[in-house]
């Protein structure tokens, strides 16, 4: 799998999960979150050559089409596969609220 | 939805499903399919700006990150959402076989 275990410990050029830290205030303009101040969101990047973690029959077809038609604008794209939630704390008045923000962290990628 | 109904009848520049015809022999090197000779596979293309059919909380966060950090390499990507099967005919000896190839046709796209 193109997950953090593999991708963070390799110099993989093809589609893989990459490290990205997001600061809530600076990068999103989110000022309501008390903790954490930011988080490791990660992102997916890299080309999707034929037979590289292709998601569906269609993405296999498209990658093969690309091999036969170099320079075509139709190509699979490296996108998140497994996403994880992020627990956050914010305040309403003086009362802390703990929430899980779903689908916030990329753990692995795929070619779709 | 960024489907064929909307995308094929508009000049949408953002993420949308685009027309693509694939010839099995010429474009894929598949010589085993008797009918059809090719099919309208379609593909997804176009930028994924903020508030544009974003798939998950993560893709919204990433698009917002992009707005606060222009030129960042981390950005959502336009990929297939709804896929449909394609019925094909091929021969085993002189005997025709009809099969459904699943996930072969793109009907709509999303930003992931």
């Amino acid at each position: 799998a193109l997950d953090t275990n593999y991708c963070f410990s390799s110099t993989e050029k093809n589609c893989c999960v990459r490290q990205l830290y997001i600061d809530f205030r600076k990068d999103l303009g989110w000022k309501w979150i008390h903790e954490p101040k930011g988080y490791h969101a990660n992102f997916c990047l890299g080309p999707c050559p034929y037979i590289w973690s292709l998601d569906t029959q269609y993405s296999k077809v498209l990658a093969l089409y690309n091999q036969h038609n170099p320079g075509a604008s139709a190509a699979p794209c490296c996108v998140p596969q497994a996403l994880e939630p992020l627990p956050i704390v914010y305040y309403v008045g003086r009362k802390p609220k703990v929430e899980q923000l779903s689908n916030m962290i990329v753990r692995s990628c795929k070619c779709s | 939805a960024l489907d064929t109904n909307y995308c094929f009848s508009s000049t949408e520049k953002n993420c949308c499903v685009r027309q693509l015809y694939i010839d099995f022999r010429k474009d894929l090197g598949w010589k085993w399919i008797h009918e059809p000779k090719g099919y309208h596979a379609n593909f997804c293309l176009g930028p994924c700006p903020y508030i544009w059919s974003l798939d998950t909380q993560y893709s919204k966060v990433l698009a917002l990150y992009n707005q606060h950090n222009p030129g960042a390499s981390a950005a959502p990507c336009c990929v297939p959402q709804a896929l449909e099967p394609l019925p094909i005919v091929y021969y085993v000896g002189r005997k025709p076989k009809v099969e459904q190839l699943s996930n072969m046709i793109v009907r709509s796209c999303k930003c992931s």
């Epitope: 303009g29 000022k31 309501w32 305040y91 923000l101 | 508030i51």
Partner: antibody
Framework: QVQLVQSGAEVKKPGASVKVSCKAS????????MHWVRQAPGQGLEWMGW????????NYAQKFQGRVTMTRDTSISTAYMELSRLRSDDTAVYYC???????????????WGQGTMVTVSS | SYVLTQPPSVSVAPGKTARITCGGN??????VHWYQQKSGQAPVLVIY???ARPSGIPERFSASNSENTATLTIRRVEAGDEADYYC???????????FGGGTQLTVL
């Protein structure tokens, strides 16, 4: 494309109730909070509250608590806002508006309905 | 309850720059959103989370937010920009969403 279509104009007498509907299309109804905002003639925007279409949970502005009820019918992707004990100063255009993010209290509204005029007059 | 103060009106000549302010106690510590409302129409989101711009909103629209004032800036103003503009924040004390009183932008 993504849109919110609201019910038609209403004329009500003081003390009565009004129920405005907001039908969503082009997106997953349960994936976004729905807010209600009103605007009296010649006045500014006033937030009334939100409903989580997924759970039915609500959060009403302090000013409207006890008078407003927000509900939804997920089978027809429709949100409702009912305001009771109407007064003449409730005369306003009532808008439904989609919250863009999920579980983000400081969120904004990316899609708005066309508005429903409610007139309260004896 | 948190109060947002906007000037009732701002006038600007075509092609010039319009600046609409939104004042609030320590507003720089809050996320600000801006809406444009043309006569007889529903509001439209023009700036999100201080300075993000939804697709379809021209680059002429920008915003900033620090200390006690948030500002919406419209460069090279056009006749079509004539509208009411509202700022909005979340009041964490009351858990309410709060709008400013609105500013009517007139293009001379």
């Amino acid at each position: 494309q993504v849109q919110l279509v609201q019910s038609g104009a209403e004329v009500k007498k003081p003390g009565a109730s009004v129920k405005v509907s907001c039908k969503a299309s082009g997106y997953t109804f349960t994936g976004y909070y729905m807010h209600w905002v009103r605007q009296a003639p010649g006045q500014g925007l006033e937030w009334m509250g939100w409903i989580n279409p997924n759970t039915g949970g609500t959060n009403y502005a302090q000013k409207f608590q006890g008078r407003v009820t927000m509900t939804r019918d997920t089978s027809i992707s429709t949100a409702y806002m009912e305001l009771s004990r109407l007064r003449s100063d409730d005369t306003a255009v009532y808008y439904c508006a989609r919250s863009f993010l999920w579980l983000v209290p400081s969120d904004a509204f990316d899609i708005w309905g066309q508005g429903t005029m409610v007139t309260v007059s004896s | 309850s948190y109060v947002l103060t906007q000037p009732p009106s701002v006038s600007v000549a075509p092609g010039k720059t319009a600046r609409i302010t939104c004042g609030g106690n320590n507003i720089g510590f809050r996320s600000v959103h801006w809406y444009q409302q043309k006569s007889g129409q529903a509001p439209v989101l023009v700036i999100y989370f201080d300075r993000a711009r939804p697709s379809g909103i021209p680059e002429r629209f920008s915003a900033s937010n620090s200390e006690n004032t948030a500002t919406l800036t419209i460069r090279r103003v056009e006749a079509g920009d004539e509208a009411d503009y509202y700022c909005q924040v979340w009041d964490s004390d009351s858990d309410d969403l709060v709008f400013g009183g609105g500013t009517q932008l007139t293009v001379l």
